[in-house]
Interface confidence: low
C-alpha cells in the first residue's frame, strides 16, 4: 500500500506568451498520494470550473484558455491540496501578446490655419506598439510644429497650408503592424482679398471692369455692394483656380458709386469675411458739356416726353456714342431717383432735370445748346426741393460721391446765365402743373442765397407760368 | 476636345440677311461668354459682337449695331449672329470663339475655323 | 473705344532672330492684353494672356511683357514655323479691340 505524500509541483508554471484570439497552457504537474484537488487563480481570484472560457484537464493539471483576450493577461497560479501536509503553489504569467490595433484612429479634420490641429491615433499591443504618421506618400517627420505624442496622437501647431493632406497612423511592434485608414487633415483659410478693385473716373456711359481677386479655404464666395445696395446692374463673371476666386463686374456706368467687394467663406458654423472698396465717379456733367459738339434734332424718347414742348429742337451731345440713348439712360437713371422725393418736388426736379439734360437747342452753323435760366434752376432748388437738395449735398458730404450733385444730373444754379442780364441766353421752364394758391402755402423757407437769388417773376404765372404743353401723369 | 463649328456663310446681296450658326463641344458651353469675330479678306481681325453665358448682356461692335443680333441657345449648345441690312463692308471670314475666363483677364481661347460671308450684288 | 496700336506692321527676319512686337493701348488696360498667331487660311491661335502669361502648349520662346498702355510679344528665337500674323487684343473693355496685326516674314 502506497504511503500518503504531499504534492510536490514537479513542472512549475511558466510565463507563457500568447497571442490574442490563440490558445494559452499553463501546466502544473504534480506528484502526490493521494490524487490532489488543484484550483488555479488568477491574479489572485478563483477560476470557476464551470466558466466555459477555460478548460482543465488532466485532473487540473493543465489550465487552458481557449481564446485568448487581451484583458486575460496577469499572475496564474496552481494550488495543489491533498491534505497531507500544506497546500503547494506555484505561479507563472500570461503574457498577452498582440499585434499592433489602432483602438481610436484618427478621424478627418478641418482646422482654421493657424491653429493647433490633434490626429488622434490610440493603441494597443504587446509589445507596446510604436507609433508614426504618413502624409501621402511619406513617412511625416516630426519637427517643432509636428509631434507623435506619447499617446500616439499626431499633435501639429500652427497649423499651415501645406499641412493639409491625407494621413494615417502606422503602430507597429515584433508581431506585426497595423495601419488606419487615410484621414484627410483640411486647413481652412480665412477669406482675404489678393487683389482689389480699382478705383475709377470716368464718363457717363463708359464701360467700367471691376476686378476682385480672393484665396480661402474652402474657396470664398465673391458678392459685389453698390452704394450698399447688391448690385443692381452689370455682368458678373467668375472663375475658380487653386483655391482663388476671380471675380470680374463689368458696369455700365451712368451713376457715380462705391462698389464694394465682398469675399466670404464658411468654416463650420462660422463665416469669415474680407472687404475691398473702390470708387467708380464720374467726370462732371457739365464738364462734358462745356466744348462739346452735337446736333439738334426732335426729342424722341419717352421720359420727358410729357415735360419738353411738343416739336422742340434738343441738343444731343456727340461726345457719347450714341447721344440719344446715353441722354435718354441718364434722364431714366434720374427719374428712378426721383421716386422718393415730394410730390412737392417732383415735377419741378422733372422739369429741371428734362431741360438740362435735353436743352433747347437753336440750329445753326454750330448748334448750341441754351441752358436754364439760373432763377428757374435756384427756385427748384430753394423752394420746390429744399429738403430733397440738402439730403442730397449731406450724402455728398459723406463721401459717397466725388463732389456736389452727382447721383442726378442737375446743373450748378450759380454757373447758369441770369434771364435779367439776358432773357434771349437761358431756357425759362414753362412748367408746374401748380395752381396759384398751392403756391402760396409753400413753407416758409431760409434761404441759404440772398433772396434776390429767387425769380421775380410776374404774379400772374403763380410764380411759374403752367404750360399747357406740360401735364403730370 | 474644345470643338467650335461655324456654318451658315454664303453669297447674299447688299441689304439681305444670313443667320450664322456655331456649334460648341467639349466643353460646358452654358458656363462660358461667347464671341463673333470676323476678318474682311486681306485684313486685320475685328472684333464683333459679344454674349454672356445666359444671355444677360449683349454687346456690339459700332459698325454692326442695329443691324446684327447675337443670341445662343445653352440648351443646343449652339450661338447664332443674325446679320441683317447687309452691306458689302460686311463681307468677312467669320469665327466664333470661346472666351476662357480664368484667373486673368479674358481671352480667347478656342475658335471656329470661320464661315465666309460675302455681301455682293 | 479702346484703341489698339501694333508696330511694326510688317518685319522681316531669319531664323534664330529674337524679334520683338510691341502694341499701345490708347488707355491704360492694366494687363487685359493677349497675342494671337494667325497662319494665312487658319483660325488665330492664342499664344499670351493677360500680357505675360504663356497658354498652355505655346513654346517658352515666346513671351509678353508689360502693363498700362504699352506691351511687347517676344519671340527668343525664331523658327520657321514662327513666320505668321501676330495680333494683339484688349480685354478691358468689351469692344475687345484688336490691333492691325503685325506681319512676320522670312527675310
Known amino acids: 500500500e502506497k504511503l500518503p505524500k504531499a504534492p510536490v509541483i514537479t513542472t512549475p508554471l511558466e510565463t507563457v506568451d500568447a497571442l490574442v484570439e490563440e490558445v494559452a497552457t499553463f501546466m502544473c504537474a504534480v506528484e502526490s498520494y493521494p490524487q490532489p484537488e488543484i484550483s488555479w487563480t488568477r491574479n489572485k481570484i478563483l477560476i470557476k470550473l464551470f466558466d466555459t472560457r477555460y478548460s482543465i484537464r488532466e485532473n487540473g493539471q493543465l489550465l487552458t484558455i481557449l481564446s485568448v483576450e487581451d484583458s486575460d493577461d496577469g499572475i496564474y497560479c496552481c494550488i495543489a491540496n491533498n491534505g497531507v501536509g500544506g497546500a503547494v503553489e506555484s505561479c507563472g504569467a500570461l503574457q498577452v501578446k498582440m499585434k499592433p490595433k489602432i483602438t481610436r484612429p484618427p478621424i478627418n479634420v478641418k482646422i482654421i490655419e493657424g491653429l493647433k490641429a490633434v490626429l488622434p491615433c490610440t493603441t494597443m499591443g504587446n509589445p507596446k506598439p510604436s507609433v508614426s504618421w504618413i502624409k501621402g506618400d511619406n513617412a511625416l517627420r516630426e519637427n517643432s510644429r509636428i509631434a507623435v505624442l506619447e499617446s500616439g496622437s499626431l499633435r501639429i501647431h500652427n497649423v499651415q497650408k501645406e499641412d493639409a493632406g491625407q494621413y494615417r497612423c502606422v503602430a507597429k511592434n515584433s508581431l506585426g503592424t497595423a495601419y488606419s485608414k487615410l484621414v484627410k487633415l483640411e486647413v481652412e483659410v480665412f477669406a482675404r482679398i489678393l487683389r482689389a478693385p480699382e478705383s475709377h473716373n470716368v464718363t457717363f456711359g463708359s464701360f467700367v471692369t471691376l476686378r476682385c481677386t480672393a484665396i480661402g479655404i474652402p474657396v470664398p464666395t465673391i458678392s459685389w455692394i453698390e452704394n450698399g445696395n447688391a448690385v443692381s446692374s452689370g455682368s458678373i463673371q467668375e472663375s475658380v483656380k487653386d483655391r482663388v476666386i476671380d471675380s470680374r463686374l463689368q458696369l455700365f456706368i451712368t451713376k457715380p458709386g462705391l462698389y464694394t467687394c465682398i469675399a466670404t467663406n464658411k468654416h463650420g458654423e462660422k463665416f469669415s469675411t474680407a472687404k475691398a472698396a473702390a470708387t467708380v465717379s464720374i467726370a462732371e456733367w457739365s464738364k462734358s458739356q462745356k466744348d462739346s459738339q452735337g446736333y439738334c434734332a426732335q426729342y424722341r424718347g419717352e421720359v420727358c416726353d410729357a415735360v419738353l414742348a411738343k416739336d422742340a429742337l434738343v441738343f444731343f451731345n456727340t461726345s457719347y456714342r450714341d447721344p440719344e440713348d446715353a441722354q435718354e439712360l441718364l434722364i431714366h437713371t434720374a427719374w428712378n431717383e426721383l421716386k422718393a422725393v415730394s410730390p412737392l418736388c417732383r415735377p419741378a426736379a422733372e422739369a429741371l432735370l428734362c431741360n438740362h439734360l435735353f436743352q433747347e437747342c437753336s440750329p445753326g452753323v454750330v448748334p448750341t445748346p441754351m441752358p436754364i435760366c439760373r432763377e428757374y434752376c435756384l427756385a427748384v432748388k430753394e423752394l420746390f426741393c429744399a429738403k430733397e437738395w440738402q439730403a442730397m449735398e449731406g450724402k455728398a458730404h459723406r463721401g459717397l460721391y466725388r463732389s456736389g450733385m452727382h447721383l442726378l444730373p442737375v446743373p450748378e444754379c450759380s454757373k447758369l446765365p441770369s434771364m435779367h442780364r439776358d432773357p434771349t441766353a437761358c431756357t425759362r421752364l414753362p412748367y408746374l402743373d401748380y395752381k396759384k394758391e398751392n403756391i402760396t402755402t409753400f413753407p416758409s423757407i431760409t434761404s441759404s442765397r440772398p433772396s434776390a437769388d429767387i425769380p421775380n417773376l410776374p404774379a400772374s404765372t403763380s410764380s411759374f407760368a403752367v404750360s399747357p404743353a406740360y401735364s403730370m401723369t | 476636345e474644345v470643338q467650335l463649328v461655324e456654318s451658315g456663310g454664303g453669297l447674299v446681296k447688299p441689304g439681305g440677311s444670313l443667320r450664322l450658326s456655331c456649334a460648341a463641344s467639349?466643353?460646358?458651353?452654358?458656363?462660358?461668354?461667347m464671341h463673333w469675330v470676323r476678318q474682311a479678306p486681306g485684313k486685320g481681325l475685328e472684333w464683333v459682337s459679344s454674349i454672356s453665358s445666359r444671355s444677360a448682356y449683349k454687346y456690339y461692335a459700332d459698325s454692326v449695331k442695329g443691324r446684327f443680333t447675337i443670341s445662343r441657345d445653352n440648351a443646343k449648345n449652339s450661338l447664332y449672329l443674325q446679320m441683317n441690312s447687309l452691306r458689302a463692308e460686311d463681307t468677312a471670314v467669320y469665327y466664333c470663339?470661346?472666351?476662357?475666363?480664368?484667373?486673368?483677364?479674358?481671352?480667347?481661347?478656342?475658335w471656329g475655323q470661320g464661315t465666309l460671308v460675302t455681301v455682293s450684288s | 473705344d479702346i484703341q489698339m496700336t501694333q508696330s511694326p506692321s510688317s518685319l522681316s527676319a531669319s531664323v534664330g532672330d529674337r524679334v520683338t512686337i510691341t502694341c499701345r493701348a490708347s488707355?491704360?488696360?492694366?494687363?487685359?492684353l493677349n497675342w494671337y498667331q494667325q497662319k494665312p487660311g487658319k483660325a488665330p491661335k492664342l499664344l499670351i494672356y493677360g500680357a505675360s502669361n504663356l497658354q498652355s502648349g505655346v513654346p517658352s520662346r515666346f513671351s509678353g511683357s508689360g502693363s498700362g498702355t504699352d506691351f511687347t510679344l517676344t519671340i527668343s528665337s525664331l523658327q520657321p514655323e514662327d513666320f505668321a500674323t501676330y495680333y494683339c487684343?484688349?480685354?478691358?473693355?468689351?469692344?475687345?479691340?484688336f490691333g492691325q496685326g503685325t506681319k512676320l516674314e522670312i527675310k
Open positions: 467639349g466643353f460646358t458651353f452654358s458656363t462660358y461668354t
Open positions: 470663339a470661346r472666351d476662357f475666363f480664368q484667373l486673368g483677364p479674358p481671352r480667347f481661347d478656342s
Open positions: 488707355q491704360r488696360i492694366s494687363s487685359f
Open positions: 487684343q484688349q480685354s478691358y473693355s468689351p469692344s475687345y479691340t
